[in-house]
């Protein structure tokens, strides 16, 4: 599998409509919770919780602050922690408790605490529960949590130093936790937790499972340095611990290695960054997408692997266990256990088979089973990804978070659209197209290139959004920017399953937002732009330039996968000529203008899609170079594109040339702008109007020229 290509389109922060939320002096917007039925997004930040309109997050509905007292801050600082940063209250748990309340926990100056937030009054109830085991002490420590039927399942550290890891259930009738032992958890970095619903109420009483994902230090591989291993672990919701052995401890805790590697190159991705569980009506069993980086990541590599949950369940219910054996010098080695396995199977959830054998609860499991699972929490079998390979491998990027949406294209094909955020504040949108990865677009969510800490996807039909949280705020982005594709070719070449071209309105529309039937819409996920209607007429721009001056002709081709070149009077322009240059890889500069430069200039793009090359006329300019006579009285003028008053525009219609151009000579390269030749010496007097037109011509666009006096400061 090859590395994923660069994103086809890059949207700068200012180019697209992004909604933002941030409050002055509030940082670390890392906990996001969406209430789809209320159209409310809850945001947990440092010392604050906000409720905002999920359809427009800039609309704040409620806020509540949970600050640390000066006394607590001082005590925290005495223990060597920073009063300005660490000794504050970082909201780490934000979970639904009931229809009217949230369960909130914070680091609380290294004294983790939890409370209930009443959603009607938007006030804390002041319960001030001990958050130990539910929330980390240190804001820098890893954590994960999930609320299951009013009980909080968490993975975090249990002490001030963060040296005691714990996976626990906070429950009034049956609280449980992991053993504090290296075979169970060895310096884990918690990433994600979720419940997988079975059918506990069905006559077979299949227990719900809670899955935990983390990276930990390996016990089974021996190297000079510490090897990190990505893990999937699970516990059973119906677990009540053992009666004597494993009393108040999980009897169902099992863990296995997650494999994500590129078999052909020996490239192993062993640091888990994020996980997303994809549930869809079309999926019998959920699929989970996991985001990885290698342990030694000096080249900026990231990978996404997808797993069938049934693969993991198979490992836990039928796989072999690992066993620790003591070798010379009391050194421990982990090997496959091939001995007899007690019945009921260690770590198994209580099912109808166990009940039939009179094991109706974990409390009456035999000691042999409990002792075995206590000593053998690690499976020998690994959980392998779908197709035994990553869905995506990307170079020169550190991905941080992932969400996935399953959507149907016009032709009925189902695509899993991966939204992956980066440590530079960007969001990549990618799909698998015939065993290759296509990164549809990259959107710069955060202007100051800060890491995205949290990513959330709304699942409500109609208005669909991705929400991203960072240190400075939250950004809301639509799933697609279909309207930004100005032509049918652009819309088709985007190969975005959310977008289709509507010939009647001549716009690229979002499929899930069109109420009208999809009849007549054009979408070609192969990128075959020949399905687009013929453009016999295209608008062009007419410019008047001064003899001897320099002209810049704009060409707004957004595709990073396209090569741009220019034709003049149907001949391809030569790059080596001192006459021309490229600005910003796409715009044409013409130096030392003369009458011979008058004529039709076309900007064309060439883009390889699969095995085809698609040519497009992106912009057309008609240039006329004139010797401007001296005006009687005139200030120095320049014609520039500005927000000033409208003077004139000339948009004309011409036939588009249909011939395929030869290999381009002047073309954009990844190196950026071409060095400009020296400017010609100015001619004439200072009172001559210096006319420079800086337009942004585009097919079917109506960009306007404005006249502005340079005296107007």
């Amino acid at each position: 599998m090859a590395f994923a290509p660069i994103p086809r389109i890059t949207w700068e922060h200012r180019e697209v409509h992004l909604v933002q939320f941030h409050e002055p002096d509030i940082y670390n917007y890392s906990a996001l919770l969406l209430s789809e039925d209320k159209d409310t997004l809850y945001i947990g930040a440092r010392e604050a919780v906000f409720a905002v309109n999920a359809l427009n997050i800039s609309e704040k509905q409620h806020e509540v602050y949970w600050k640390v007292s000066e006394d607590k801050k001082a005590k925290c600082a005495e223990k060597g922690k920073s009063k300005q940063t660490e000794c504050l209250n970082y909201i780490r748990v934000l979970q639904p408790l009931s229809a009217t309340s949230l369960y909130v926990c914070g680091t609380n100056a290294f004294q983790p605490a939890c409370d209930h937030l009443n959603l009607t009054s938007f006030k804390f109830l002041g319960k001030n529960e001990d958050g130990k085991g539910r929330c980390p002490f240190d804001p820098a420590h890893s954590y994960t949590s999930v609320m299951v039927d009013g009980e909080l399942y968490s993975g975090t550290s249990y002490n001030f130093l963060g040296s005691e890891p714990i996976i626990s259930r906070n429950s009034s009738h049956s609280p449980l936790r992991t053993e504090y032992a290296i075979p169970w958890l060895n310096e884990p970095s918690f990433v994600f937790a979720d419940v997988i619903r079975k059918s506990p109420d069905s006559p077979d009483g299949e227990d719900d499972r809670v899955y935990f994902f983390f990276t930990e230090v390996s016990v089974e591989y021996e190297f000079v340095f510490r090897v990190l291993i990505p893990r999937i672990a699970r516990v059973c919701k119906g677990d009540q611990g053992g009666l004597r052995t494993l009393q108040k401890k999980w009897t169902s805790f099992l863990k296995a290695r997650l494999i994500c590697s590129r078999p052909d190159s020996g490239l192993v991705f062993n640091v888990l960054r994020d996980v997303f569980v994809l549930r869809s009506p079309g999926l019998k069993v959920p699929v989970f997408y996991a985001l990885f980086t290698p342990q030694l990541n000096n080249v900026g590599l990231s990978a996404v692997c997808a797993y069938n949950l049934s693969t993991a369940e198979e490992v836990f219910s039928h796989g072999k266990y690992m066993q620790s054996t003591t070798v010379e010098q009391s050194h421990t080695k982990w090997v496959r256990y091939n001995g007899p396995v007690p019945k009921p199977r260690p770590g198994a959830c209580i099912d109808s088979e166990a009940r039939a054998a009179n094991y109706t609860s974990s409390l009456n499991l035999p000691d042999k089973t409990l002792q075995f699972v206590k000593d053998h929490p690690l499976m020998d079998d690994s959980v392998t990804p779908i197709d035994n390979r990553p869905r995506l491998i990307k170079k020169d990027v550190n991905y941080t978070q992932i969400v996935v949406d399953r959507t149907q294209a016009l032709d009925g094909t189902v695509y899993d659209v991966m939204f992956v955020s980066t440590d530079r504040g960007a969001l990549h949108k990618a799909i698998s197209l015939e065993h290759a990865v296509h990164i549809i677009e990259e959107t710069q969510l955060f202007q100051d290139f800060e890491p995205v800490q949290t990513l959330l996807l709304s699942s409500k039909k109609g208005n669909r959004f991705v929400y991203a949280g960072s240190n400075s705020g939250v950004v809301q982005a639509p799933l697609a920017f279909c309207g930004k594709h100005g032509t049918c070719e652009d819309c088709v070449l985007a190969r975005d399953p959310y977008c289709a071209w509507s010939p009647p309105t001549a716009t690229c529309v979002a499929l899930h937002q069109t109420e009208s039937p999809s009849r007549g819409l054009i979408q070609e996920m192969s990128g075959d732009a020949s399905v687009c209607p013929d453009k016999s007429k295209g608008s062009y721009r007419q410019h008047f330039f001064k003899h001897g001056g320099t002209a810049e002709l704009k060409c707004s081709q957004k595709s990073n996968l396209a090569r741009v070149f220019w034709k003049f009077q149907n001949g391809v322009l030569k790059a080596e000529s001192p006459k021309y240059g490229l600005m910003g890889r796409k715009n044409l500069l013409i130096f030392n203008l003369s009458e011979g430069d008058s004529g039709v200039y076309q900007c064309l793009s060439e883009e390889r899609v699969k095995n085809k090359t698609v040519f497009q006329v992106v912009a057309k300019h008609v240039l006329e170079v004139k010797v401007v006579p001296k005006p009687v009285v005139a200030p120095t003028l320049s014609v520039v594109q500005t927000e000033g008053s409208r003077i004139a525009t000339k948009v004309l219609v011409a036939s588009t040339q249909g011939s395929s151009p030869p290999t381009p000579a002047v073309q954009a390269t990844s190196s950026g702008a071409i060095t400009l030749p020296p400017k010609p010496a100015p001619t004439g007097t200072s009172c001559e109007p210096k006319i420079v037109i800086n337009t942004v011509p585009q097919l079917h666009s109506e960009k306007t020229m404005y006249l502005k006096s340079s005296d107007n400061r």
Epitope: H173, S174, D201, S202, P203, D204, G238
Partner: antibody, heavy 121, light 112 residues
Framework: EVKLEESGGGLVQPGGSLSLSCAAS????????MSWVRQPPGKAPEWLGF??????????EYSASVKGRFTFSRDNSQSILFLHMNALRPEDSATYYC????????????WGQGTSVTVSS | DVLMTQTPLSLPVSLGDQASISCRSS???????????LEWYLQKPGQSPKLLIY???NRFSGVPDRFSGSGSGTDFTLKISRVEAEDLGIYYC?????????FGGGTKLEIK
């Protein structure tokens, strides 16, 4: 031997309240879901809902016909199941059965003998 | 709610004869886990219902092998190969795949 025995039935006026009990023996009560079923005279039984076991926090599931009016609870120390009925209507008149739901692939394996409730003015 | 319809309402038989009772559900009663939780109960006069068949065709412990269940999707059948006197009473089908669980209207097996 598994035994279930209902009690507390009788005559009650419309709008009134009544509580039924079901004493269980012969099995570990906390490990089982327990269900209530009623049967009006000469008609088919009607499932009213269940209360889950200890592993599932003794939470409840009700049928729409009784939701909001009837409440299930259990005294696990005494192995007794309760059905609290409020705002009773004439159509609630029936024989009320408690039954064990064992999660063994089938639903109601053991039933009590039933207790009769009549709602009439 | 899933409506369970039983036919016939009444089934007069001679002892030793075969009896067949039909039960039809208003929608598929295949559970999301793939199992079909269709059960048959027998209620004798003055007694509570007793479980005979579960998961369409499995006999509950102690149930004689003259009782058999079959069917799938929405159509199910209970057969008694040779009716005995102790088999008389009202038979109910019962679906426990979807909440609320629902009973059929009953079929009365009586002597001809």
């Amino acid at each position: 031997e598994v035994k279930l025995e209902e009690s507390g039935g009788g005559l009650v006026q419309p709008g009134g309240s009544l509580s039924l009990s079901c004493a269980a023996s012969g099995f570990t009560f906390t490990d089982y879901y327990m269900s209530w079923v009623r049967q009006p005279p000469g008609k088919a039984p009607e499932w009213l809902g269940f209360i889950r076991n200890r592993a599932y926090g003794y939470t409840t599931e009700y049928s729409a016909s009784v939701k909001g009016r009837f409440t299930f609870s259990r005294d696990n120390s005494q192995s007794i199941l309760f059905l609290h009925m409020n705002a009773l209507r004439p159509e609630d008149s029936a024989t009320y059965y408690c039954a064990r739901y064992p999660l063994l692939g089938y639903a109601l394996d053991y039933w009590g003998q039933g207790t009769s409730v009549t709602v009439s003015s | 709610d899933v409506l369970m319809t039983q036919t016939p309402l009444s089934l007069p038989v001679s002892l030793g004869d075969q009896a067949s009772i039909s039960c039809r559900s208003s929608q598929s009663i295949v559970h999301s886990n793939g199992n079909t939780y269709l059960e048959w109960y027998l209620q004798k006069p003055g007694q509570s219902p007793k479980l005979l068949i579960y998961k369409v065709s499995n006999r509950f412990s102690g149930v004689p092998d003259r009782f058999s269940g079959s069917g799938s999707g929405t159509d199910f059948t209970l057969k008694i190969s040779r009716v005995e006197a102790e088999d008389l009473g009202i038979y109910y089908c019962f679906q426990v795949s979807h909440v609320p669980w629902t009973f059929g209207g009953g079929t009365k097996l009586e002597i001809k």
